[in-house]
Amino acid sequence: EICGPGIDIRNDYQQLKRLENCTVIEGYLHILLISKAEDYRSYRFPKLTVITEYLLLFRVAGLESLGDLFPNLTVIRGWKLFYNYALVIFEMTNLKDIGLYNLRNITRGAIRIEKNADLCYLSTVDWSLILDAVSNNYIVGNKPPKECGDLCPGTMEEKPMCEKTTINNEYNYRCWTTNRCQKMCPSTCGKRACTENNECCHPECLGSCSAPDNDTACVACRHYYYAGVCVPACPPNTYRFEGWRCVDRDFCANILSAESSDSEGFVIHDGECMQECPSGFIRNGSQSMYCIPCEGPCPKVCEEEKKTKTIDSVTSAQMLQGCTIFKGNLLINIRRGNNIASELENFMGLIEVVTGYVKIRHSHALVSLSFLKNLRLILGEEQLEGNYSFYVLDNQNLQQLWDWDHRNLTIKAGKMYFAFNPKLCVSEIYRMEEVTGTKGRQSKGDINTRNNGERASCESDVLHFTSTTTSKNRIIITWHRYRPPDYRDLISFTVYYKEAPFKNVTEYDGQDACGSNSWNMVDVDLPPNKDVEPGILLHGLKPWTQYAVYVKAVTLTMVENDHIRGAKSEILYIRTNASVPSIPLDVLSASNSSSQLIVKWNPPSLPNGNLSYYIVRWQRQPQDGYLYRHNYCSKDKIPIRKYADGTIDIEEVTENPKTEVCGGEKGPCCACPKTEAEKQAEKEEAEYRKVFENFLHNSIFVPRPE
């Protein structure tokens, strides 16, 4: 029987009974948070052979081996992973061995076995026989191998029963427990699975089979399962489902969901039965089971029960993620926040249509409304008292509405109202009237010319750049000296610059009034000599990188006809020169014959220009004499036995330091101090562990039902 869609067994070990008749778990299996040590010997699930997603074990007291629970678990497909892992064994306090002696294949994903204080038989398993790549496996903080004394079956009697393979240059027997070898198929089978009697399975089988060369006798399928047969692709009129089986249209239509999109059922797209159309596609009609490509971003209608959605934090904005049409009214009231502009753009940037009104008030954290970067239509179906559909009141730092050169916004019905926005120039409001088609709708008091823009440089002159010079990590720029009517009003200049891969940045990108700003800022004093043009050397830049730069004059708030004069430049795009690339990454060399070396590498992380070719140099090395000096028959002193507590940052210390050849003399040597690179790697490793642990806790801890 197929069980699913993922099974979560927690708190009570008796819930394991849910696995009784399962042959395939379509989804994940979680066994976790069972704090009372129980006797699991009476629980055995020999029917379970396949888990299509991942297996997660976390804090299950009393469980010593998985072999008795899942004696026939053969394949973990990893169709969906837990933080890149298909098998996670974490903080299993009593687990002594994994024991999954029939586990033959983890199709996708790596394994993470961490902080299991009593867990042995880890170095005796050759994971490369089970996984395609072992480089991402993370096996850390378990019982030290030297304390385990792992012995494979028959080793003590000097009649070893298991086969040997090489791991990390160590040729050894491979087993899961003291009495279970790790199964290996004859080399004649190649990548194919084999029976218990070492006969090769059908190429479409995965893991194992009950009869050789028979696609109906597979324990699991390499590709897809359909009507008792393993097939390379789903037959006509059937569709891939959950990455492992083929289902017909009727089956797909009859899947019931309890997730947010359940009202429309599953869809068939690109030969697959799936919960929703993939990114960039939309249903071809509300009752359709088929998807068609969207023109532009896919429409997503969001509705607010109470008609008006208040955006007063990032959390409230989060509810609008992906929405393109908002049915209702938007009330924006952002008084403070961290990195607010980019967060709002992330969650509200796709909104194109608001059916009601938009009201922005007391939003002192906002400098611009450009976070609503796709808003093109305010219908004004519902309006504020006084027939306003766009209302902007008391926003102390609002300087820009939108970049009107690249913005088309229509307000279909209703008027606009602006008051007490001291940094918002009236010219900006008048420009909005023209663009939105509301010119003539507003009465005299709707746009207050006295208290909008009273603290801004609304009459701006243009500063012109006069020269630019670049090197690999520097830019020198100069600009015309700005001369306001009264030269004493000019205080200094501020240069703004940032990396800009594309020529599409605006002054207000990522900027809010709470200190977040995607631009770097440098103050430039006036040159004492009136004939010298002001300029700056920007240094510490990246080679072969395009930067956007603009300059603003810092002036006294000098009022002339109720307006403050200021000056700023257009945005200039300028690229630094190319430089030497960083070193190529992951250089690997291997010999495939007595006269050839194959060398592979990845491109440098910092090309610093357009790479045109690589230079490969090699030279013959003399044999290392040290190899002959060491006595390989001598065993190092066995360290003092120490119980592993599941922590990681413990260095094993023996009573006497090892005596090695050191500095030309024999004598005790201290370990070399760690290099900066090693320290950095350790720091990153610790950080990565924390990130995983947080992910684990956030994923599995849920509030207790009320």
Partner: nanobody
Framework: EVQLVESGGGLVQPGGSLRLSCAAS????????MSWFRQAPGKEREFVSA????????RYADSVKGRFTISRDNSKNTLYLQMNSLRAEDTAVYYC????????????????WGQGTLVTVSS
């Protein structure tokens, strides 16, 4: 602890009607697909009907199509089965079952089960 408690069973004449209820104690009732199964004496448990989390979609076994209606009230954490035109072969213990996230037509191993309520159709 998730609990499902069925009620509404009893003796009814052929052609009659009954309404079964299933009261669920779970934090987010709407995130479970709910189903009715039944088991007649000496027979295997069989699927009767299921309903999606929001209640907008449902499916039925061929033997009950047109006669039975499944519904749910998420505000009351309750599942219902309205049974009309009852026949003698509908006699069985009716079980309410819940599965998180989704249920395919071939899932019979639901996560949570009630104790059952007996429906007897006899003249």
């Amino acid at each position: 602890e998730v609990q499902l408690v069925e009620s509404g069973g009893g003796l009814v004449q052929p052609g009659g009607s009954l309404r079964l209820s299933c009261a669920a104690s779970m934090p987010t009732f709407s995130s479970f697909v709910m189903s009715w199964f039944r088991q007649a004496p000496g027979k295997e448990r069989e699927f009767v009907s299921a309903i999606s989390g929001s209640g907008s979609r449902s499916r039925y076994a061929d033997s009950v199509k047109g006669r039975f209606t499944i519904s749910r009230d998420n505000s009351k954490n309750t599942l219902y089965l309205q049974m009309n035109s009852l026949r003698a072969e509908d006699t069985a213990v009716y079980y309410c079952a819940a599965n998180p996230r989704r249920a395919t037509p071939d899932y019979t191993q639901y996560a949570y089960w009630g104790q059952g309520t007996l429906v007897t159709v006899s003249s």
